[in-house]
């Protein structure tokens, strides 16, 4: 059976989160997708969404969030760049399917952003270095105002996933140290 899980990413200010959410290609390829934050005791809040209908491999940038929907492959890529401590929280990808409730995708992301110097990646056996620049031309999409009422905010155990930032470029490191915890079955 499919389990709803959380994956915890511990990053430093100025670093980036680079994740993907998969969806059923046949059902949702051109549907509008969104990236939401779920804060304790609050309704999920939509931060960014793809266009409607969603365009294939067309980056959409809303502030520091970049969404790219590879709907030939059933994958939504989400990048949050130049992370701030206040970005910490529980995130999820959803698919808008009005008039029905948004459809939540697996997995949820527990992001913990801490202050501190993000220098050169260390010698951790899992460390990686993905440097990329924010796409120069992107489109801001209008997102529906409604949010999903489903909230689950169980905190998983600690894990490590460091990232570092030289100047304006973003390095992603230690993404393999992410912890997965079941939220419910």
């Amino acid at each position: 059976a499919t389990k709803l899980t959380e994956e915890k990413y511990e990053l430093k200010e100025g670093q980036t989160l680079d994740v993907k959410c998969d969806y059923t290609l046949e059902k949702f390829a051109s549907s509008q997708k969104a990236w939401q934050i779920i804060r304790d005791g609050e309704m999920p809040k939509t931060l960014a969404c793809t266009e409607r209908p969603s365009k294939n491999s067309h980056p959409v940038q809303v502030g520091r969030i970049i969404l790219e929907d590879y709907h030939d492959h059933g994958l939504l890529r989400v990048r949050m760049v130049n992370l701030q401590v206040e970005d910490s929280g529980l995130y999820q990808c959803v698919i808008y399917q009005p008039p029905k409730e948004p459809h939540m995708l697996f997995d949820r992301i527990r992001l913990v952003v801490t202050k501190g110097f993000s220098g050169t990646p260390g010698s951790n056996e899992n460390s990686t270095q993905n440097v990329y620049k924010i796409p120069p031309t992107t489109t801001k999409a209008l997102c529906p105002l409604y949010t999903s009422p489903r909230t689950v905010t169980q905190a998983p155990p600690k894990s490590t996933a460091d990232v570092s930032t030289p100047d304006s470029e973003i390095n992603l490191t230690n993404v393999t140290d992410i912890i997965r915890v079941p939220v419910f079955n």
């Epitope: 998969d22 290609l25 059933g74 270095q129 993905n130 993404v175």
Partner: antibody, heavy 123, light 107 residues
């Protein structure tokens, strides 16, 4: 340690289908995507697509989209790749591969490979 | 789709030589590039990920560099066991594609 053990070699006639299995051990099967890569004899590597064993969702390159089906049985930690309407140019070694990072990480580094399954298509 | 062009397609070198293989992407792929080694009759093995990071257990004579469109894979001192075909692979976007391979042999 992580192991991916694939099913044995197959000989098929043109137009037939083949289903290759990939049994995973040494890690939590539902935590990492399984990808499929093929290699025709003496040729280079060709990515076919991916599957998330937790959600069951999958995606494949346009070239294979109408002919390939990727499934899994989580109870026995096994992934399957079925290729239909076989033609002679599908003769290749098919590899299942596990990525370096968890399913949610955008990180397509092929860290753990099965031993490969030779599929021969011949009339 | 992004095309990955490796050069040379084959090369012959002596034990102890410094060997360099290049990989060129058809457009900027930042550092989303991996290198693999494949010995005859075996599955490929990940050597370098994200352009320059050495996979655990891989000898330090192997290294990678570059970003954007031009990448280099280097063996600082060729050993007999390094005889293999080497492939680059990008993942800047989907679909993922590989270079055509570089076959390395001992003189």
């Amino acid at each position: 340690q992580v192991q991916l053990v694939q099913s044995g070699a197959e000989v098929k006639k043109p137009g037939a289908s083949v289903k290759v299995s990939c049994k995973a051990s040494g890690y939590t099967f539902t935590s990492y995507d399984i990808n499929w890569v093929r290699q025709a004899t003496g040729q280079g590597l060709e990515w076919m697509g991916w599957m998330n064993p937790n959600s069951g969702n999958s995606g494949s390159v346009k070239k294979f989209r109408d002919r390939v089906t990727m499934t899994r049985d989580t109870s026995i930690s096994t992934a399957y790749m079925e290729l239909s309407s076989l033609r002679s140019e599908d003769t290749a070694v098919y590899y299942c591969v596990r990525l370096i990072g968890y399913s949610s990480a955008y990180k397509w580094s092929f860290q753990h490979w099965g031993q490969g399954t030779l599929v021969t298509v011949s009339s | 789709d992004i095309q990955m062009t490796q050069s040379p397609s084959s090369l012959s070198a002596s034990v102890g030589d410094r060997v360099t293989i290049t990989c060129q992407a058809s457009r900027d792929i930042s550092k989303y590039l991996n290198w693999y080694q494949q010995k005859p009759g075996k599955a490929p093995k990940l050597l370098i990920y994200d352009a320059s990071n050495l996979e655990t257990g891989v000898p330090s004579r192997f290294s990678g560099s570059g970003s954007g469109t031009d990448f280099t894979f280097t063996i600082s001192s060729l050993q007999p066991e390094d005889i293999a075909t080497y492939y680059c692979q990008h993942y800047d976007n989907i679909p993922i594609t590989f270079g055509q391979g570089t076959r390395l042999e001992i003189k």
